[in-house]
Interface confidence: low
Amino acid sequence: MVRLPLQCVLWGCLLTAVHPEPPTACREKQYLINSQCCSLCQPGQKLVSDCTEFTETECLPCGESEFLDTWNRETHCHQHKYCDPNLGLRVQQKGTSETDTICTCEEGWHCTSEACESCVLHRSCSPGFGVKQIATGVSDTICEPCPVGFFSNVSSAFEKCHPWTSCETKDLVVQQAGTNKTDVVCGPQDRLRALVVIPIIFGILFAILLVLVFIKKVAKKPTNKAPHPKQEPQEINFPDDLPGSNTAAPVQETLHGCQPVTQEDGKESRISVQERQ
């Protein structure tokens, strides 16, 4: 076995101390170049020149409309994203030297992807369908068929199914049944009902009259008992809120075909919403 003199061993140690082994890994926010660890450029700055034995890493701030969002050794900054208005895009958040511009879609449009590089128009729900969920910047309109008792007569990206008008609460009757696309058509109480109700009223009055006549005849007969006091016929009060004499808030009548139709008070006549670009 070859033995090295003690001074050689010591000399070797000394050399190692003066000239350390080139690093194979660098600390966080550093990078290895030419066997040296150089500092990375901070976000918002780009690399101009690597460090040397004698100089630090040289960095320069990104220009206007440029950014770098990480500690880096990039020689070029990235361009801010352009929110192209013709693609329906607008700036949601302006970019800085450290962050990219964030685009979103104009109202009435939604992003085609998570990156939101372009937009398409929101889908409209056709008549017979209502909006279950209004579209957002990233999701399309969700439509649902109008269930029984509800309708939608427009193509819209915003309107839900509307409930049919309740004719009864307006002291009106259903003249035409509703569908998923049309509202119920209400109208005043029809003549048929009047033709049934009037004879009944007259019948009741006639019966009352007969009873009164019969009572009078009975009263005229001589009896041993004390005579009954004379009974006056009772006054009959007819309510003044019979169908047709509604004193509630006025309703506007319009002609529907040849039938007068009532537009429910407080309910607008609805027309299609013109979808935005």
Epitope: Y82, P85, L87, E117, L121
Partner: antibody, heavy 117, light 107 residues
Framework: QVQLVQSGAEVKKPGSSVKVSCKAS????????MHWVRQAPGQGLEWMGQ????????QYNEKFKTRVTITADKSTSTAYMELSSLRSEDTAVYYC??????????WGQGTLVTVSS | DIQMTQSPSSLSASVGDRVTITCKAS??????VAWYQQKPGKAPKLLIY???YRYTGVPSRFSGSGSGTDFTFTISSLQPEDIATYYC?????????FGGGTKVEIK
Amino acid sequence: QVQLVQSGAEVKKPGSSVKVSCKASGYAFTSYWMHWVRQAPGQGLEWMGQINPSNARSQYNEKFKTRVTITADKSTSTAYMELSSLRSEDTAVYYCARWGLQPFAYWGQGTLVTVSS
Amino acid sequence: DIQMTQSPSSLSASVGDRVTITCKASQDVSTAVAWYQQKPGKAPKLLIYSASYRYTGVPSRFSGSGSGTDFTFTISSLQPEDIATYYCQQHYSTPWTFGGGTKVEIK
């Protein structure tokens, strides 16, 4: 797949009008702008105008504003470009082109309009 | 209107050559520039949009770069099927305008 099919070639007299059609298929017609671009023989491309078929909103190049009308029929997914007061320099191939996710990604095959007396 | 000045108007190169076309906008258009290829009797085809994004199905030999007013279109290795006229177009603001075109031929 997306297709834009244009009407056939036309020969017109100066002063008259021409109406070129562009039938779209393979995508939601109302979701994308439709544009018209023309190219005179041996010349470059010139944008004429655009329409949003969903609301019929159109926009024109000032150069053609007084003579061009762009319309769209949603029921047939067809866009139309009408150019009036034709002159010999209007002899060109007229293209419809769809703009959406990318600019002018889809083009019609072109319609040659010849203006000659 | 934004003018797009394209150069050269024509060029001749050998198969395998690197071909570069430039386009200068009359004002800042950010990165809103597209490049099209047009062969005789055919409609233009989109190759590049937003200055550097290759459109679906476009071979990797086609690339674009630039921002602001100066833009470059490159064919890294010219192929016989690349013989065509190439146009730049700004998609920054209306009216959408095109460059005058560059006719590429094989030597």
